[in-house]
């Protein structure tokens, strides 16, 4: 069948069909209804909401829905143990302890099961000792403390501010610095934007609010037992000491009030800028130690959290494509939350739900996508990204051979300000025409394209007339498939305005505030930016699922290849003796990108010109587009981190958050002048220019005439 | 030597608003917090809330706003809906180390018809 | 909120008297307690900070000791300047909150 026999309903009114379909007033209905109680991974609130969504999908008309279960490793505190922090005097009495809850919001009182603030994986511990403060404990900041200052935080518990990089880096970072537990607090300069009111008044975070989340450094790897491999019922796990990721020294999260009791007696060093500076009224004394009359006072940490193996469940979606069901696009979010996910992951869920509604009434009327489309609700994202990695571990030789796209359906909103995309170049283009379609919400651009406002309010930093799409880091569900696997992905959602909000995130991110009501009265009260994104994330699934020739254009890939590489070559630049006594030469990596981009434009010209009517000729084409990205992974992976494989991009060493480019030629390069072996540093630098080469080299020819 | 220098008396009608001003020099206006307490007529001392951002007593919880001008040190004290008993000397401390070492010289607020 | 609980609420003594005045809270403050004398037309003025250490130019007649619930402040030998209302403030918990006052009166 072609694709146009597999429907009842004309192809160019199938996009309009499903659009038109989706409904503000049920992503608001779905998400009140998902965030009612708590549903934290691993608890039998989670499981329920996944039996019920599995029962809605299938009333929705999808060909099967499955739960697929993992018994993987995951964190609580003690019940009966709370996790605290103290201020103690000389003598060991507790003349301070931090909050052991958040107040909870108006009209969840009494709700049970709302998990105290922690962070997940943390060791159990109770060391004491004096403060250090670490800024926001990036890498630069322990540069700037060890190397500039001269302050030592071995022995020490440093107390950093969230915000700016993941806050398992601000562990990791930490426990190379020799601390020996760490707090992690929310600044307001960061978490409260001025002139907004704390919630319940407002979307700010109030001085009792905390931001709980996993301390991981996992690199990829899924369950911290079984790293490649499924968590199954036959899985052969690690001991506990030999897991993957796990913090190594205790750490635990606090609100701006409680900080303010440790901070304000600060001693020591005073801050080296205004750039260590928060909003709290207190010095920002880097320390170590309290001041003057404090100075026999230290702070002592109380952890008894404790790691385990839990059983976690994915709710898996099918809808059975007409023409090419071998061929997967898959749309998945997660459902697990810290608290009532009211943002973090409901606001995506909702949507999520409303795309199945959507897709679910076409096919009710006879409707078929081309291509078989898979719908996820992941487990334990929270957790390390466990329901989504594991699943993909346990179906990856399925995945890289029928993989065309993943589409992350997290939070759909973190602002109402403008659209916000991650994403392969391959899929600028569908995001530019798919944009350029949909109608935009914002104030001010009634009758006007959602691509005119985006590239308005968020305008490329290179292309004017463009939007700004930004490179997929990590830190969320996508990791997997992009970053191990090379499926082409994508993430879209509605974001603030990052020029007059300087904050991290949004102020209730992981807090118990994080409301159904947060949303409805304050973010989207009339749900036009959910609508807006679910049909950017729908449509984007649509097109991929639908459209004959796959809408990727390699083009993209060729113009970004040329500017990573030449960003990589000026860093290396810095450093002219070092390159020409080592004889660092870039001339193979642009060489491999001009032979690329001349490929990929020969290759854009046979895709005008090939016959669509021939059905063997198109399967080869998409596949050519389909494989691009797997073309990217290098088996062996990058040095240190196996799975992460992709060659052009890695999340940021630094920062999980972030997407790097060249990531191997870049960390080899990465304060390359402290290194006390620059003949071997060098070396290696060399070496990943190699790798970087031949990769882009070899994908370029996967695009070649393949005869 | 710090010192906190409050704007002048004040007579209110029942209903309106008075917004007290408190200058702060001598020390870094940004590392500490600024206070208001407030003592009526013969009374005990009754603190009106403070810290960073702001933290209201609950008793004056959405008719009190305190505000601060960092470029000019200067922090600010709005109380709303007045009534006869908010009749009081209204008094700037600064916060450090979670007390109030340094006040200003109070400012008496009379409310009458 | 925390109750501050001061006793006596007046007291009458002596030049040269030991005066001792009490402060209790009620749930734990740990050392977040604060004690100010007040004059009549005058502020305030701090006088013991975290329970017992004096702040700076205070005399040191004066000291401050307790943590958790109870807490006392002491005057070891009364001068003619100390005749005044003496206040404790709990600054623990994010709304502080004063003991309702001591008036030491000469006898």
């Known amino acids: 069948k072609s694709s146009n026999e597999a429907t009842n309903i004309t192809p160019k009114h199938n996009m309009k069909a499903f659009l038109d379909e989706l409904k503000a007033e049920n992503i608001k209905k779905f998400l009140y209804n998902f965030t009612q109680i708590p549903h934290l991974a691993g608890t039998e609130q989670n499981f329920q909401l996944a039996k019920q969504i599995q029962s809605q999908w299938k009333e929705f008309g999808l060909d099967s829905v499955e739960l697929a279960h993992y018994d993987v490793l995951l964190s609580y505190p003690n019940k009966t143990h709370p996790n605290y922090i103290s201020i103690i005097n000389e003598d060991g009495n507790e003349i301070f302890n931090t909050s052991l809850f958040e107040p909870p919001p108006p009209g969840y009182e009494n709700v049970s099961d709302i998990v105290p603030p922690f962070s997940a994986f943390s060791p159990q511990g109770m060391p004491e000792g004096d403060l250090v403060y670490v800024n926001y404990a990036r890498t630069e900041d322990f540069f700037k403390l060890e190397r500039d200052m001269k302050i030592n935080c071995s022995g020490k518990i440093v107390i950093a501010r969230y915000g700016k990089v993941f806050r398992g880096n601000k562990v990791k970072n930490a426990q190379l610095a020799g601390a020996k537990g760490v707090i992690l607090y929310s600044d307001p300069a960061d978490y409260f934007a001025p002139g907004v009111k704390s919630y319940p008044d407002g979307w700010n975070l109030p001085g009792g609010g905390v931001q709980r989340g996993n301390i991981l450094n996992l690199n990829g790897a899924g369950d911290p037992l079984t790293p490649g491999y499924p968590a199954n019922e036959y899985a052969y796990r690690r001991g506990i000491a030999e897991a993957v990721g796990l913090p190594s020294i205790p750490v635990h999260p606090i609100g701006y009030y409680d900080a303010q009791k440790l901070l304000e007696k600060m001693g020591g060093s005073a801050p080296p800028d205004s750039s260590w500076r928060g909003s709290l009224k207190v010095p920002y004394n880097v320390g170590p130690g309290f001041t003057g009359n404090f100075s026999t006072q230290k702070v002592k940490m109380h952890i008894h959290s404790t790691n385990e193996v839990t059983r976690i469940y994915n709710v898996i979606g099918t809808l059975r494509g007409a023409v090419e069901p071998d061929r997967y696009v898959i749309l998945g979010g997660h459902r697990d939350s810290w608290v009532f996910g009211g943002i973090d992951p409901q606001s995506g869920a909702a949507v999520v739900h409303e795309i199945v509604r959507s897709f679910g009434t076409l096919k009710k009327e006879g409707w078929r996508p081309r291509r078989t489309i898979l719908f996820a609700s992941w487990d334990a994202e929270e957790f390390g990204l466990l329901g989504s990695t594991e699943w993909a571990e346990e179906n990856s030789r399925l995945l890289q051979e029928r993989g065309v796209a993943y589409i992350n359906a997290d939070s759909s909103i973190e602002g109402n300000y403008t659209l916000r995309v991650d994403c392969t170049p391959l899929m600028y283009s569908l995001v530019h025409n798919l944009t350029k379609e949909l109608k935009s919400p914002d104030e001010g651009f009634e009758g006007k394209s959602l691509y005119e406002s985006w590239t308005k309010k968020s305008p490329s930093p290179e292309f004017s007339g463009m939007p700004r799409i930004s490179k997929l880091g990590s830190g969320n569900d996508f990791e997997v498939f992009f970053q191990r696997l090379g499926i082409a992905s994508g993430r879209a959602r509605y974001t603030k305005n990052w020029e007059t909000n300087k904050f991290s995130g949004y102020p209730l991110y992981h807090s118990v505030y994080e409301t159904y009501e947060l949303v409805e009265k304050f973010y989207d009260p009339m749900f036009k930016y959910h609508l807006t994104v679910a049909q950017v994330r729908g449509g984007m699934v649509f097109e991929l699922a639908n459209s004959i020739v796959l809408p990727f254009d390699c083009r993209d890939y060729a113009v970004v290849l040329r500017k990573y590489a030449d960003k990589i070559y000026s860093i290396s630049m810095k450093h002219p003796q070092e390159m020409k006594t080592y004889s660092v030469s870039f001339d193979s990596l642009f060489s491999a990108v001009k032979n690329f981009t001349e490929i990929a434009s020969k290759f854009s010209e046979r895709l005008q010109d090939f016959d669509k009517s021939n059905p063997i000729v198109l399967r080869m084409m998409n596949d050519q587009l389909m494989f691009l990205e797997r073309a990217f992974i290098d088996p062996l992976g990058l040095p240190d981190r196996p799975f992460y494989r992709h060659v052009i991009y890695a999340p940021s060493s630094h920062n999980k958050y972030a997407g790097e480019s060249f990531p191997g030629i870049y960390d080899a390069l990465f304060d390359i002048e402290s290194k006390v072996d620059p003949s071997k540093a060098w070396g290696e630098v060399k070496r990943q220019i190699y790798v970087a080469a031949f990769t882009v080299q070899a994908a370029a020819e996967t695009l070649s005439e393949v005869a | 030597q710090v010192q906190l220098v409050q704007s002048g008396a004040e007579v209110k009608k029942p209903g309106s608003s008075v917004k007290v001003s408190c200058k702060a020099s001598g020390d870094s206006f940004s590392n500490y917090g600024i206070s208001w307490v407030r003592q009526a007529p013969g009374q005990g001392l009754e603190w009106m809330g403070g810290f960073t951002p702001v933290n209201y007593a609950q008793k004056f919880q959405g008719r009190v706003t305190i505000t601060a001008d960092e470029s000019t040190s200067t922090a600010y004290m709005e109380l709303s809906s007045l009534r006869s008993e908010d009749t009081a000397v209204y008094y700037c401390?600064?916060?450090?180390?979670?007390?109030?070492?340094?006040w200003g010289q109070g400012t008496l607020v009379t409310v009458s018809s | 909120d925390i109750q501050m609980t001061q006793s006596p609420s007046s007291l009458s003594a002596s030049v040269g008297d030991r005066v001792t005045i009490t402060c209790r809270a009620s749930q734990n403050i740990g050392s977040y307690l604060n004690w100010y004398q007040q004059k009549p037309g005058k502020a305030p003025k701090l006088l013991i900070y975290?329970?017992?250490i004096l702040q700076s130019g205070v005399p040191s007649r004066f000291s401050g000791s307790g943590s958790g619930t109870d807490f006392t402040l002491t005057i070891s030998s009364l001068q003619p300047e100390d005749f005044a209302t003496y206040y404790c403030?709990?600054?623990?918990?994010?709304?502080?909150?004063f003991g309702q006052g001591t008036k030491v009166e000469i006898k």
């Open positions: 401390a600064r916060d450090r180390w979670s007390s109030f070492d340094y």
């Open positions: 403030l709990q600054s623990y918990s994010t709304l502080w909150t």
């Open positions: 975290a329970a017992s």
